[in-house]
Amino acid sequence: MAVTACQGLGFVVSLIGIAGIIAATCMDQWSTQDLYNNPVTAVFNYQGLWRSCVRESSGFTECRGYFTLLGLPAMLQAVRALMIVGIVLGAIGLLVSIFALKCIRIGSMEDSAKANMTLTSGIMFIVSGLCAIAGVSVFANMLVTNFWMSTANMYTGMGGMVQTVQTRYTFGAALFVGWVAGGLTLIGGVMMCIACRGLAPEETNYKAVSYHASGHSVAYKPGGFKASTGFGSNTKNKKIYDGGARTEDEVQSYPSKHDYV
């Protein structure tokens, strides 16, 4: 039961995380105008990965896409790439993990196959989460650098003849959404990897075989021989029924009447 719960929870957490990564990638508020020096501005600027927006005193908001590809900063392109890779990996991970879920039965898929798929999706979620966290962090670093550069240049332009305040940008809501979403995807991936350990068929139980030595009648029962899975030893107490080992989690479960979206 614990393995199913861990796997299911990992899937749900990753699903929320990937939805968050998609939302963050689409959001326009990656950077927002810093109002510290100009709290009374009637024109509020904010920027996303794909377009920049201006909210005017009328309440009207105008957004313009970045219609150039080559003219954009390399860092912005890198952030876009990281977020897209994160989304793609996460989406593939979700697809794989759906089939890997214990509560969903597909044909005669063996537990070893489900374990491998769970591990694969877990790794994909981990990489997806790391991509999102890296993308958001790179953008945040870019903002911090530009913020202090613009602060240094704020009163040096135009020889002080014109009172013009250079627009500075600070962290937007999308950064926090991205960090949280990346973290959730990462946690979900770790949970999937942990669930994989419980799914793997860790014990091979042989039926009792009698070896007749000359003059002696000794029976050797190597029923408790462990098959290595690479995930350490299993400490569970397992009952042996007719030479086959099955934990509580491995009891055959039939899909309940639910809609899987």
Partner: antibody
Framework: QVQLVQSGAEVKKPGASVKVSCKAS????????IHWVKQAPGQGLEWIGY????????NYNLKFKDRATMTSDTSSSTAYMELSRLRSDDTAVYFC????????WGQGTLVTVSS | DIVMTQSPDSLAVSLGERATINCKSS????????????LIWYQQKPGQPPKLLIY???TRDSGVPDRFSGSGSGTDFTLTISSLQAEDVAVYYC?????????FGGGTKLEIK
Amino acid sequence: QVQLVQSGAEVKKPGASVKVSCKASGFTFTSYNIHWVKQAPGQGLEWIGYISPGNGGSNYNLKFKDRATMTSDTSSSTAYMELSRLRSDDTAVYFCATGRGFAYWGQGTLVTVSS
Amino acid sequence: DIVMTQSPDSLAVSLGERATINCKSSQSLFNSGNQKNYLIWYQQKPGQPPKLLIYRASTRDSGVPDRFSGSGSGTDFTLTISSLQAEDVAVYYCQNDYSYPLTFGGGTKLEIK
């Protein structure tokens, strides 16, 4: 078409309050801020502040902040501007305006403060 | 607060002639976010509310005749009427649309010579 229809002229005594209404039609009321502008007889224009019907947010000119209160009722698409503790220099035409670059204006409400 | 200074206070121009009204702001109205200047021009006739002519310093509102044009950047702006018509007699105001409180110029009264 976009229309802003304001309430009728008011005559008030000093120290009293007046509430001017501005009924909007022809556009999504919650999409744009409603601004209020004062014009004293024979004088120029003075911005009082705005109300954002979408979220109830507002911004006031400090000169009016302690006496002006802006509200809105989204169900009737109406914005209100209440001016309290009226003085003789509050005698003016009060306009509501909205749209990009204040493209749409109400016809104005004359408020006369006289003892 | 941003102070808007209009000049001249009044202007008399012959029909068909060019009329030029200037507006100067105490601070730049340029927004680096979209490279636009947030200045508005209005026309007001007696007993009427102001009518929007130009927003963002140079963008003509729909329905405004093309004889009206706006120019300028930063702190200095100009409204030009290329060929004055009788119906253009009015008071013209410029407005800071960049920083709160939104402020208006004192107005320029345009008459026919």
